[in-house]
Interface confidence: medium
């Protein structure tokens, strides 16, 4: 053997972000010819050896973090890179603002608002049409979402998320949307 | 083949930060994750935090406070920013590869000294 | 966090003997244990990944066992290129390595 088993993709179908009672598959995917799967849930003993996971009603005791590898032969895989199962509407939704509006001039200044009646520390804000949360993918503890010289791709339906670092994996719904409209055309840059 | 090199000012003064760079080659940023540990003069290793492929972050809850980790995809550079630096921080500073770090640099020797 | 517990902190012993290092968790890690050997002046080598498999070109004089929270790392067949500070790394839920274990050849 020339090389490690190569580590296996774990991906979330149609989305790592689920709602409560909403269907999700968890399908980790290894080169061809595996022998065996095992896909689990870190931080609990709950796993299975088979490489696809179906859940037909997400329930708060399923987020977290999953993982998965193989084995072929005697021999296992490295891990697959960690997947965060979130799920969603466990609380009430946060509002989500523009300020100064949600109608800007390219190469101006907009900053996003995501408000809640509790005491959340943690936020996230996420563009249509975009998988991943909006900016930085690390976790934010400030509500404000700063978007400095706005251009053409800034314009969109955003939604935010607000959440407790004590639960990072139960999120509230999703605020309702918020169409950013950029208007102009792109400052040249100098 | 996989290499990764890291870079540091060697010297920092007590209560400053500390910058070091990890840059990497034979493979991508977006496919592995990058940790950083550390090995205080005749200690043990101590591993400090991680960035993942998606740019995702995990911190030792000790050094939660005052570390941070963040990378450039296109530069092949994963950094790590250490804040209000004492004595207890002295050690050699390495970056390594993804679970369970299979590739790892030689390291660089961080001194914290007035 | 998860603490790891290695034993023992050093240990001699002779050139074609056997040497065995354990390492307990404070809770179940679900067999996600490395093994790396670290010489002076190097950055570490993995050994073994998941509790027993062996990285590429490993001698298979390096083996791993164990389940739960309870670990072993074996070397037989001592070698003097052996010399050099051996940990077990948990990867169940972040990261966290056990003290090292100095091995030195009689």
């Known amino acids: 053997q020339s090389g490690p088993l190569p580590k296996p993709s774990l991906q979330a179908l149609p989305s790592s972000l689920v709602p409560l009672e909403k269907p999700v598959t968890l399908r980790c995917q290894g080169p061809p010819g595996v022998d065996l799967y095992r896909l689990e849930k870190l931080s609990s003993s709950r796993y299975q050896d088979q490489a696809v996971l179906f859940i037909p009603a997400m329930k708060r005791s399923l987020a977290g973090r999953y993982r998965c590898s193989y084995q072929n032969g005697s021999l296992w895989s490295l891990p697959s890179d960690q997947l965060e199962l979130v799920a969603t509407g466990v609380f009430a939704k946060p509002s989500l603002s523009a300020q100064p509006g949600p109608a800007v001039s390219s190469g101006g200044d907009v900053t996003l608002q995501c408000q809640t009646r509790y005491g959340f520390d943690q936020f996230a804000l996420y563009k249509e049409g975009d998988p991943a949360p909006y900016k930085n993918p690390e976790r934010w503890y400030r509500a404000s979402f700063p978007i400095i010289t706005v251009t053409a791709a800034h314009s969109g339906t955003y939604r935010c998320y607000s959440f407790s670092s004590r639960d990072p994996y139960l999120w509230s719904a999703p605020s309702d949307p918020l169409e950013l409209v950029v208007t102009g055309t792109d400052p040249i840059p100098e | 083949q996989v290499q990764l090199q890291e870079s540091g000012p060697g010297l920092v003064a007590p209560s400053q930060s500390l910058s070091i760079t990890c840059t990497v080659s034979?493979?991508?940023?977006?496919?592995?994750?990058v940790n950083w540990v550390r090995q205080p003069p005749s200690r043990g290793l101590e591993w400090l935090g991680m960035?993942?492929?998606?740019?995702?972050?995990d911190y030792q809850s000790t050094l939660k406070s005052r570390l941070s980790i963040s990378k450039d995809n296109s530069k092949s550079q994963v950094f790590l920013k250490m804040n209000s630096l004492t004595t207890d921080d002295t050690a050699r500073y390495y970056c390594?590869?993804?679970?369970?770090?299979?590739?790892w640099g030689q390291g660089t020797s961080v001194t914290v000294s007035s | 966090d998860i603490q790891m517990t290695q034993s023992p902190s050093s240990l001699s012993a002779s050139v074609g003997g056997r040497v065995t290092i354990t390492c307990k968790a404070s809770?179940?890690?679900?067999?996600?244990i490395a093994w790396y050997q670290h010489k002076p002046g190097k950055g570490p080598s993995l050994l073994i990944h998941?509790?027993?498999t062996l990285q590429p070109g490993v001698p298979s004089r390096f083996s791993g066992s164990g389940s739960g929270r309870d670990y072993s790392f074996s070397i037989s067949n001592l070698q003097p290129e052996d010399i050099a500070t051996y940990y077990c790394?948990?990867?169940?839920?972040?990261?966290?390595f056990g003290g090292g274990t100095k091995l030195e050849i009689k």
């Open positions: 390594a590869r993804d679970l369970p770090m299979d590739y």
């Open positions: 034979g493979f991508s940023l977006t496919g592995y994750g």
């Open positions: 960035i993942w492929g998606d740019g995702s972050t």
């Open positions: 809770q179940d890690i679900n067999k996600y």
């Open positions: 998941y509790t027993s």
């Open positions: 790394l948990q990867y169940a839920l972040l990261l966290t």
